[in-house]
Every structure is written in structure tokens, then in C-alpha cells.
């Protein structure tokens, strides 16, 4: 049936999905105080550009009775739960924030006549890329696999002057939504990172991953994995590691590497860490006083989604153009707006760009240190440090297969 | 509390060496590196060179190299500058500085030793 | 090398006003949102002491009438109100690559 969306005569409604499973176990208060958190600013700002509206968040929660497993495994259904909810309500907003699993993501986007933008935190896997009316305000891996590609390929820093063409893959199916997808992504037999790497083994064991750190017989002496310095610990607690080893430690969401004084343990030494650059100012906000650091960018691209909406409003109003048009619900993309934190880009299919951030342990001072930032917008890499004290022989990166010369 | 104690004044003929010293008290020596910073008179302050103690690590201004050695001691949490073949233009107060790095790689200098005087004349 | 420009390079101000003192990179002094630019004050033979680290973070234990503030290449010291006390000579220090000081700026009282 066709529901009518609550979107004109100066009444614009958020519809905002409060899913039990989710990307991240985030409290929904805390994602309800982030969405209140934006919408105290979009009304400012649209108070002060002199249009004089209101816009209001509903927020949509599924029973949790039936989809209780409070992770993504069970969220496709979920989700759809939650729009015959809409339907039933013959209530939509002018935009659906949420889903962030991508199981409902994708389920949602196949089975709905999506005349309406969808925003969500989250939907990292490859099957959420290159929808018309979907945006993703948390980094999905197609861009992380475009780092990857662009990192094993460079070859002209003083400190990697090797390309790389294998890797192997720690993944052992006990990973969060996010490291669940990036590392499907670098699985996948057709994805960009399989078809540019010559050797790639996805290794599912923990004693497979340990063999390999010693074992004189590897294909590469490159590792990536997905999570925090603790789950690399656990995995390899303090075993020797060969001296070519580079371990990759895809850790995005994550600032704690940026807070004043911390120390890289001693297991981090042969391991560069690739996360996101950190915001300033939300140490401070109201909204993540309670969030952990990995936490913060969940409720972070909440907040955004609604500036989002709340940027592309004003646009449209000033144009004195109708928000319930397909026109709209193209619209969130290829810009840039003003998030809580700064600046945000959307590349052309609403993918959120960002500056990603390599780091490794110094040996002056056991401190993570840049390596080098890359930008997703431009696939482009910038190093920072030109002379790192790195662990590694000479200060460089080792090649990938060991014994294997100047390329 | 975090000091740094550095050596007395010098007084040393043209040509000759000197080894200053500044020794750390109040924190892991290992932790941070050690900054040295040039002063003359009526003149403002150059960075002169970092060294590591955790790692020996040692990092100088183009200017100085070959003027000045820097080291340091770990079971003393002392750190050296060793000036030699001295001219008049190395009369000045030398400072030694604790050095904090940050993860984007850069350095600030946040407790100072109350610095050495040196003096190069016939 | 960078070249940090201090102006003015002296400065005679009244008690109880503001002073500004600006410091100039030749080139950005900024990197991942972070801005390299740290202010010291020296004072008639003491060593120099460290006021704001990383442009607009004050050191602790260093009154609030010391303020600082900037990006890229253009950076300000501010001292309000100034105090008898806050006689000496000024440094801005970048860290972005080889540590390079600015001039100094001297700060009298009128």
C-alpha cells in the first residue's frame, strides 16, 4: 500500500529505525540522545538561514521478542518487521534513518519502492555499495579495499619500497559487523583486493594464524586482521614473530591509538594499525560522555544523518523544490555538509569519505606514531613520516615473500 | 616532581671540546626523548638535536652536525652534548628539554633545564 | 626548512590590556586536524617555559589569560589581561618538521 510520508506544509519527520540488532551494542538511548542531539542543531540552523519549520524524529522500535539475537545475524527480518510497521502506520518520514546491519539493509533496499532516502550507520558489506537512494555515513569496505590495494601497490616511500602482491587473511568468524564485512570483502573471489593480489589465503584458525608467524615456508610475510590490539594479543599473546612480518591491524573505529599517554604494548611492534583520523570535538558533546572510544562513531553518524537531512532541507527549501521526489531522495550525495565535527564528504554513491590513518609503534618511545593518511576521496596516499623508527630491518617495510628482490 | 639538572658553566679555549651533561629526575627516562636548544645572546633559540634514550635514536639540525654529539645513559637517566672544535659562535647558554612525542608524529618541548653557559675565548 | 615570522618583534603594552603576538608558518604547519604550533615564554635568565602545546592547549598550571589560537600558517598568542608578571620574550615553535623557532617577540610593560 502506499504510505504518504509526513514531509510538507513546514512539518518534516525523521523516521529513525531503533533496530535490537545492530552494527554496534549501543544502548538505543544513546543513539535516541544523539538523534535529539542533531536535531537541536538542524532546527538552529534552519532557524537561522530564516526558514521557519519543524522537523521532529520518530522513533520506529521492533518488539524484540522475535529478533532478540542483539547482533546483525537476525536482523534481516527485523527490518523488514519494522517497515510493515511503517506501512501499517500509513506513516513515513521524509527520510529512514537506520538500518546499520547489512543483511536488513539489503533485504530492506530489494524489497521496498525506495521513493525516499535511506541514511545509515553502518551496511559495511560490498552488497550495499552503488544504491541510488542508500547512504553510508561509517566507512564501508570497498573504501578500506581500495586503501589496501593502493598501500600494497606503492613502492616509492622511503619506507616501502616493495610492492606487495600477496597477503594472508585472519578471519575466524567470531568477528564485530564491521571486521565481519571488510574482511568478506577481501575474501570474496571477485572483489577488487582478490583480482589485484597475485596470492591471497584466508586463514580460519588461531593455530593456523600462529604456524604462519614463524613458518619458513609462508607465501607472504603480510597478515591483515580486523579488530583491537587486545584481540591480537589474544590470538598471538607474546609468541616470537619472524622478523618480516608485517601484521595489519584494521581497527577503524577506534581513537584510544589518539588519547594522551598511551603506550603500545610490545606485542604491537610488528604491526601497523589502520584506523580513522580521530574528531576534536566530541570528546566533550553531551552525547558520547558515556560512549566508549569505538563507540563514538555509531552515534557520531547518527547525529550526522540528521545534519545531514537537516543540509539537504535547506537546499531544497531555499529552491522552493518538493521533498517527497525522487530528485530528493537521489540527492545524498557527491557533497559535501557540515557534520557535528566538521566537514563531511559523500563521494558519488553516498559512501562517506574520510582520512584514514596508518600508524606504527616507534621504537623511541613504544608510542603509535603516523606512518602515513590516506583519502579515500582521491585514493591517494600521503606519508607523513618519511624516517620512521620502525622495528623493521633498515627502517623499511619488508617485501612480501620473503628472500624476494627489488621489484 | 619531572627536573632536569644540568652541568656548570664551561669556559674552554678555540678548538677545544666540551661535554655537557643533564640529568633527568621525576619520570621514566625512557619515555621521552632529549631535546638540546642553543641561545646567544640577543639572538633567539635554535633546536640543535633529539636523542632516544629507549632506543639511542638520534636526530640533529643539519647546522649542527658535526658540531655537536649527543648520548645518553640509561642507568644514570643522563643525557650528554658533546661540543667540539669550539669557536666563538658556539658561546651561549645550552638547554637541555624534555621531549614529548604525539601520534601524528611531532615534538613539543614541556620541562627545561635551567641551562649551561658556555664560553669560548683565548 | 619552515620559517616561522614573529610580529611584532617587541611590544609595549598597558597593564590590564590584551596583547596579541602572531605567528607566521611559510608553509601548513597542520596535519590530521592537529596543528604543530607550541608557544614558550622566556624570561631574563630563566629557561624557557612551555605555555600552549599544539596551538590552543593550554599547559597546565599556566593562567587562563593565556590564550592561543590559529590553523595552517597563521597562529596567535593572546595575553588578557596583561600583568607585570607577563614580561619576557615570547617563541612560537613548529613541529610539523625539522623544529624550527620563531624570532621572539618582546613584551614590555608601558
Known amino acids: 500500500s502506499q504510505v504518504s510520508q509526513n514531509c510538507h506544509n513546514g512539518s518534516y519527520e525523521i523516521s529513525v529505525l531503533m533496530m535490537g540488532n545492530s552494527a554496534f551494542a549501543e544502548p538505543l538511548k544513546n543513539l535516541e540522545d544523539a538523534v535529539n542531539e542533531g536535531l537541536e542543531i538542524v532546527r538552529g540552523r534552519l532557524q537561522n538561514a530564516g526558514l521557519n519549520v519543524t522537523v521532529n524524529a520518530t522513533f520506529m522500535y521492533s518488539d524484540g521478542l522475535i529478533h532478540n539475537s542483539g547482533d546483525c545475524r537476525s536482523s534481516t527480518c527485523e527490518g523488514l518487521d519494522l517497515l510493515r510497521k511503517i506501512s501499517n502506520a500509513q506513516r513515513m518520514g521524509c527520510v529512514l534513518i537506520g538500518p546499520s546491519c547489512t543483511y536488513s539493509t539489503f533485504q530492506m533496499y530489494l524489497d521496498t519502492e525506495l521513493s525516499y532516502p535511506m541514511i545509515s550507520a553502518g551496511s559495511f558489506g560490498l552488497s550495499c555499495d552503488y544504491k541510488e537512494t542508500l547512504t553510508r555515513l561509517m566507512s564501508p569496505a570497498r573504501k578500506l579495499m581500495y586503501f589496501l590495494v593502493n598501500f600494497w601497490k606503492t613502492n616509492d616511500l622511503p619506507f616501502k619500497t616493495y610492492s606487495w602482491s600477496t597477503s594472508y587473511v585472519y578471519k575466524n568468524g567470531t568477528e564485530t559487523e564491521d571486521c565481519f564485512w571488510y574482511l568478506n570483502a577481501l575474501e570474496a573471489s571477485v572483489s577488487y583486493f582478490s583480482h589485484e593480489l597475485g596470492f591471497k589465503v584466508v586463514l580460519r584458525q588461531d593455530k593456523e594464524f600462529q604456524d604462519i608467524l614463524m613458518d619458513h615456508n609462508r607465501k607472504s610475510n603480510v597478515i591483515i586482521m580486523c579488530g583491537g590490539p587486545e584481540f591480537l594479543y589474544k590470538l598471538k599473546g607474546d609468541r616470537a614473530v619472524a622478523e618480516d612480518i608485517v601484521i595489519i591491524l584494521v581497527d577503524l573505529f577506534n581513537d584510544q591509538y589518539f588519547e594522551d599517554n598511551v603506550t603500545a604494548p610490545d606485542y604491537m611492534k610488528n604491526v601497523l594499525v589502520l584506523t580513522l583520523s580521530p574528531g576534536n570535538s566530541l570528546l566533550n558533546s553531551s552525547f558520547s560522555r558515556n560512549l566508549s572510544p569505538t563507540k563514538r562513531d555509531f552515534a557520531l553518524a547518527y547525529l550526522n544523518g540528521i545534519l545531514l537531512f537537516g543540509h539537504m532541507l535547506k537546499i531544497f527549501l531555499e529552491n522552493g523544490e518538493n521533498i517527497t521526489t525522487p530528485k530528493f531522495a537521489h540527492a545524498f550525495r557527491n557533497l559535501t555538509f557540515e557534520g557535528y565535527d566538521g566537514p563531511v564528504t559523500l563521494d558519488d554513491w553516498g559512501d562517506v569519505d574520510s582520512t584514514m590513518v596508518l600508524l606504527y609503534t616507534s621504537v623511541d618511545t613504544k608510542k603509535y606514531k603516523v606512518l602515513l593518511t590516506y583519502d579515500t576521496h582521491v585514493n591517494k596516499t600521503y606519508p607523513v613520516d618519511m624516517s620512521p623508527t620502525f622495528t623493521w630491518k633498515n627502517s623499511k617495510l619488508p617485501n612480501d615473500i620473503t628472500g624476494r628482490g627489488p621489484q | 616532581q619531572v627536573q632536569l639538572q644540568q652541568s656548570g658553566a664551561e669556559l674552554a679555549r678555540p678548538g677545544a671540546s666540551v661535554k655537557l651533561s643533564c640529568k633527568a629526575s621525576?619520570?621514566?627516562?625512557?619515555?621521552?626523548?632529549i631535546t638540546w636548544v642553543k641561545r646567544r645572546t640577543g639572538q633567539g633559540l635554535g633546536w640543535i638535536g633529539e636523542?632516544?634514550?629507549?632506543?639511542?635514536?638520534?636526530y640533529y639540525n643539519e647546522k649542527f652536525k658535526g658540531k655537536a654529539t649527543l648520548t645518553a645513559d640509561k642507568s644514570s637517566s643522563t643525557a650528554y652534548m658533546e661540543l667540539r672544535s669550539l669557536t666563538s659562535e658556539d658561546s651561549a647558554v645550552y638547554f637541555c628539554?624534555?621531549?614529548?612525542?604525539?601520534?601524528?608524529?611531532?615534538?613539543?618541548?614541556?620541562?627545561w633545564g635551567t641551562g649551561t653557559t658556555v664560553t669560548v675565548s683565548s | 626548512d619552515i620559517v616561522l615570522t614573529q610580529s611584532p618583534a617587541s611590544l609595549a603594552m598597558s597593564l590590564g590590556k590584551r596583547a596579541t603576538i602572531s605567528c607566521r608558518a611559510s608553509?601548513?604547519?597542520?596535519?590530521?586536524?592537529?596543528?604543530?604550533i607550541h608557544w614558550y615564554q622566556q624570561k631574563p635568565g630563566q629557561p624557557p617555559k612551555l605555555l600552549i602545546h599544539?596551538?590552543?592547549n593550554l599547559e597546565a598550571g599556566v593562567p587562563a589569560r593565556f590564550s592561543g589560537s590559529g590553523s595552517r600558517t597563521d597562529f596567535t598568542l593572546t595575553i588578557d589581561p596583561v600583568e607585570e608578571d607577563d614580561v619576557a620574550i615570547y617563541y612560537c615553535?613548529?613541529?610539523?618538521?625539522?623544529?624550527?623557532f620563531g624570532g621572539g617577540t618582546k613584551l614590555e610593560i608601558k
Open positions: 628539554a624534555r621531549a614529548i612525542t604525539t601520534v601524528v608524529g611531532d615534538w613539543y618541548f614541556d620541562v
Open positions: 621525576g619520570y621514566t627516562f625512557t619515555s621521552y626523548g
Open positions: 636523542i632516544y634514550p629507549r632506543s639511542g635514536n638520534t
Open positions: 608553509e601548513s604547519v597542520s596535519l590530521i586536524g592537529t596543528n604543530l
Open positions: 599544539h596551538a590552543s
Open positions: 615553535l613548529q613541529s610539523r618538521k625539522i623544529r624550527t
